[in-house]
Amino acid sequence: MAVTACQGLGFVVSLIGIAGIIAATCMDQWSTQDLYNNPVTAVFNYQGLWRSCVRESSGFTECRGYFTLLGLPAMLQAVRALMIVGIVLGAIGLLVSIFALKCIRIGSMEDSAKANMTLTSGIMFIVSGLCAIAGVSVFANMLVTNFWMSTANMYTGMGGMVQTVQTRYTFGAALFVGWVAGGLTLIGGVMMCIACRGLAPEETNYKAVSYHASGHSVAYKPGGFKASTGFGSNTKNKKIYDGGARTEDEVQSYPSKHDYV
């Protein structure tokens, strides 16, 4: 029973984690304009892995995609790669783990096969979680470096009275979503690996021993006994994370100039 619970919980936790990784990857708020010195701003900048956006005080939001591949910083490309690898591994892991679940019967699949699949999916979840955590951490490190660099050159003089105030960026919501999601996927993977140990059949065959009782002969032959673990009835694995990332393709979100009541 405990093994099934551990496996089921590991699956659910990983599912939530991977949903979170997908959401974080799609989110636009990987870095947001630092408002420390100016909490109320007319133009609020924020950036994601795929596009950068501006929310105006007027209420309009406009996003612009990174339409170049070669012109992007290598670090950003690396973060994208890590997040995509994390998603792909996690998705494969989920697929494998569905068939590995003890509560799901598929033909005459041996417990040993289920144990192997559980271990495989567990490792995949662990690597997926690590990829997400690594990706988010690399981006966070990049932000910290840039933050202090732009603080040092907060005002780059352009001669006379003209000055360019550099926009400083700080951690966006996607980073925290990514860290938590990566952590959950990692935990789910560890739980799957633990469940695998319990699923692996222990072949403890005892030699047959004959007992001769007076009067009649009874042969007691214990052997090949497998401990049967009951399986949980809860097969509804709800996807709880609703990654509020906007994935629409439109670049601008404006009301029409004459939107009547």
Partner: antibody
Framework: QVQLVQSGAEVKKPGASVKVSCKAS????????VNWVRQAPGQGLEWIGM????????RLNQQFKDKATLTVDKSTSTAYMELSSLRSEDTAVYYC???????????WGQGTLVTVSS | DIVMTQSPDSLAVSLGERATINCLSS????????????LTWYQQKPGQPPKLLIY???TRDSGVPDRFTGSGSGVDFTLTISSLQAEDVAVYYC?????????FGQGTKLEIK
């Protein structure tokens, strides 16, 4: 079509208060910020502040923080600006304007002349 | 606060000729998120409220004739009227829409020579 109609001209004594109204029509009032701008006779434009009709959130130019109070009445789609402790320097035409994309003001009221004179 | 400085203060141009008004900002008006410049141009005729001509430094508002062109980026902006018409006589203002408080240039008075 979009229209912003302001209240009529006012003549006030120094130290008094005045409330200028701006009635909006032809668009969804609660979707757009309403700005207030003043123009002293023969002078340029000066931004006072703006108010969002949906939550009455305001952004005020620090220069006017003790002078202007911005409010809205959603039921009548009207924005108000109250000017207190009037002085002769407050004599100006006061405009309301809707905020469009790019933080630009696309539709303007006809203006309200406030004259402060003893 | 961002200071907007227009030049010249007044300008006299012949009908059909090109008119150019400059606007210099004390700070960059370029938003990194969408690479747009938050600079707006208005036209004000005597006894009338200002009229929006151009926003985002170069985007013409609906109904604005295409003889009006906005250009520039960062701190330096220009409004160009390619062929001056009699109805273009007015005062022109530039406005910072990048940061609070929104500020206007002192205005440029355009007249016919």
């Amino acid at each position: 079509q979009v229209q912003l109609v302001q209240s009529g001209a006012e003549v006030k004594k120094p130290g008094a208060s005045v409330k200028v109204s701006c009635k909006a029509s032809g668009y969804s009032f609660t979707n757009y910020w309403v700005n207030w701008v003043r123009q002293a006779p023969g002078q340029g434009l000066e931004w006072i502040g703006m108010v969002h009709p949906s939550g009455s959130e305001t952004r005020l130019n620090q220069q006017f923080k003790d002078k202007a109070t911005l409010t809205v009445d959603k039921s009548t789609s009207t924005a108000y600006m109250e000017l207190s402790s009037l002085r002769s320097e407050d004599t100006a035409v006061y405009y309301c304007a809707r905020v469009w994309s790019g933080n630009a003001f696309d539709y303007w009221g006809q203006g309200t002349l406030v004259t402060v004179s003893s | 606060d961002i200071v907007m400085t227009q030049s010249p203060d007044s300008l006299a141009v012949s009908l059909g000729e090109r008119a150019t008004i400059n606007c210099l900002s004390s700070q960059s008006l370029l938003a990194s998120g969408n690479q747009r410049n938050y600079l707006t141009w208005y036209q004000q005729k005597p006894g009338q409220p200002p009229k929006l001509l151009i926003y985002w430094a170069s985007t013409r508002d609906s109904g604005v004739p295409d003889r009006f062109t906005g250009s520039g980026s960062g701190v330096d902006f220009t409004l160009t009227i390619s062929s001056l018409q009699a109805e273009d006589v007015a005062v022109y203002y530039c406005q910072n829409g990048f940061s609070f408080p929104f500020t206007f240039g002192q205005g440029t008075k355009l007249e016919i020579k």
